[in-house]
């Protein structure tokens, strides 16, 4: 199963929408969210600290989309019209990772395994779910 | 120097509105977040919400959900804290704070606090 | 809400003394908590982010440690400007939540 693909089998029995409680993903586009997210956390708390880690390399604008990519894995968007959590979709991810990966690299960090792009949906569209870019970011 | 300048101290009866500001100076206002902090008299500290000046974007404690609005006037680097229908377990220094990198590190600068007496 | 206790609640101690607060989380919050010092009738101070990060300005005798669930505030020697409150905090996630404070007086 592709991260964000829709599966109406999997809606059933799916957790509601919850209010984004993550300090780092206020003000992103959107606040409702799912536990689990596409990273395996089952708490909003056990994913904001782990996401906080990120925190020096979002302050250092390697890319300006990567609070919105990052929230969108730790905290993917909610609706009630989808069952699935909804990441970002891969062109951005990849994006991400060509600017940010090198700023880690300085400072002997590797791009996490747990972020890999191939993982995404290519692009949005009714059998696999992604978000943009926001315009505004 | 970084200061946060708070207005002075007021009394309200129950059921009315007290609104509170808060001037920053000595940093980029628009880049870090200000919190809004209460003391009841003899306790603890108790977050009341968070507010973003650079899109107005606000966070708030469950608690004072639909009674606390935060808004700020850019052109004066100010941010209000409007609590209503006051009740005497309102009454309580309020202080402001500013807030780095989404909160993650503390609050590194607050404001001398804004006493709310609530009384009949 | 991320519920945070503190112990003890009060203590006596005298000038010189190693003085150890102690702050839980009801849940991991990872190393995200603040310490602040606050004296009567003024503002909260910041003294540790991130559990052990000194604030520029604090003096070196504040020290911090833990992760996930328990952490410490240590004064490794008690000075007379340091009788105080002290309070956590989380910064986790929303809503931030305090400590109730640990009073620190004299002996």
């Known amino acids: 199963l592709e991260i964000g693909r829709f599966d109406p089998e999997r809606g059933r029995g799916a957790a509601p929408c919850q209010a984004v409680e993550i300090p780092m993903c206020r003000g992103i586009g959107y606040n409702l969210t799912r536990m689990p997210n596409l990273l395996g956390h089952t708490s909003q708390g056990e994913a904001a600290a782990e996401l906080a880690e990120f925190a020096p390399l979002v302050q250092y604008g390697c890319h300006s989309h990567l609070r919105f990519f990052l929230c969108s894995l730790y905290a993917p968007m909610c609706t009630d019209q989808v069952s699935t959590p909804i990441p970002a979709c891969r062109p951005m991810c990849e994006q991400a990772r060509l600017r940010c990966a090198p700023i880690m690299e300085q400072f002997n960090f590797g791009w996490p395994d747990s972020l890999d792009c191939a993982r995404l949906p290519t692009r949005n569209d009714p059998h696999a779910l992604c978000m943009e870019a926001p315009e505004n970011a | 120097q970084v200061q946060l300048v708070q207005s002075g101290a007021e009394v309200k009866k129950p059921g009315a509105s007290v609104k509170v500001s808060c001037k920053a100076s000595?940093?980029?206002?628009?880049?870090?977040?200000i919190n809004w902090v209460r003391q009841a008299p003899g306790q603890g500290l108790e977050w009341m919400g968070g507010?973003?000046?650079?899109?107005?974007?606000?966070i708030y404690a469950q608690k004072f959900q639909g009674r606390v609005t935060m808004t700020r006037d850019t052109s004066t680097s100010t941010v209000y804290m409007e609590l209503s229908s006051l009740r005497s377990e309102d009454t309580a220094v309020y202080y402001c704070?500013?807030?780095?990198?989404?909160?993650?590190?503390?609050?590194?600068?607050w404001g001398q606090g804004t006493m709310v007496t609530v009384s009949s | 809400d991320i519920q945070m206790t503190q112990s003890p609640s009060s203590l006596s101690a005298s000038v010189g003394d190693r003085v150890t607060i102690t702050c839980r989380a009801s849940?991991?919050?990872?190393?995200?908590l603040a310490w602040y010092q606050q004296k009567p009738g003024k503002a909260p101070k910041l003294l540790i982010y991130?559990?052990?990060s000194l604030q520029s300005g604090v003096p070196s005798r504040f020290s911090g440690s833990g992760s996930g669930t328990d952490f410490t505030l240590t004064i490794s020697s008690l000075q007379p400007e340091d009788f105080a409150t002290y309070y956590c905090?989380?910064?986790?996630?929303?809503?931030?939540?305090f400590g109730p404070g640990t009073k620190v007086d004299i002996k």
């Open positions: 849940q991991s919050i990872s190393r995200w």
């Open positions: 000595g940093y980029t206002f628009t880049s870090y977040d």
């Open positions: 507010f973003d000046p650079e899109d107005g974007e606000t």
């Open positions: 905090q989380q910064t986790n996630t929303f809503p931030f939540t």
């Open positions: 991130a559990a052990s």
């Open positions: 704070a500013k807030a780095g990198d989404w909160g993650l590190y503390g609050m590194d600068v």
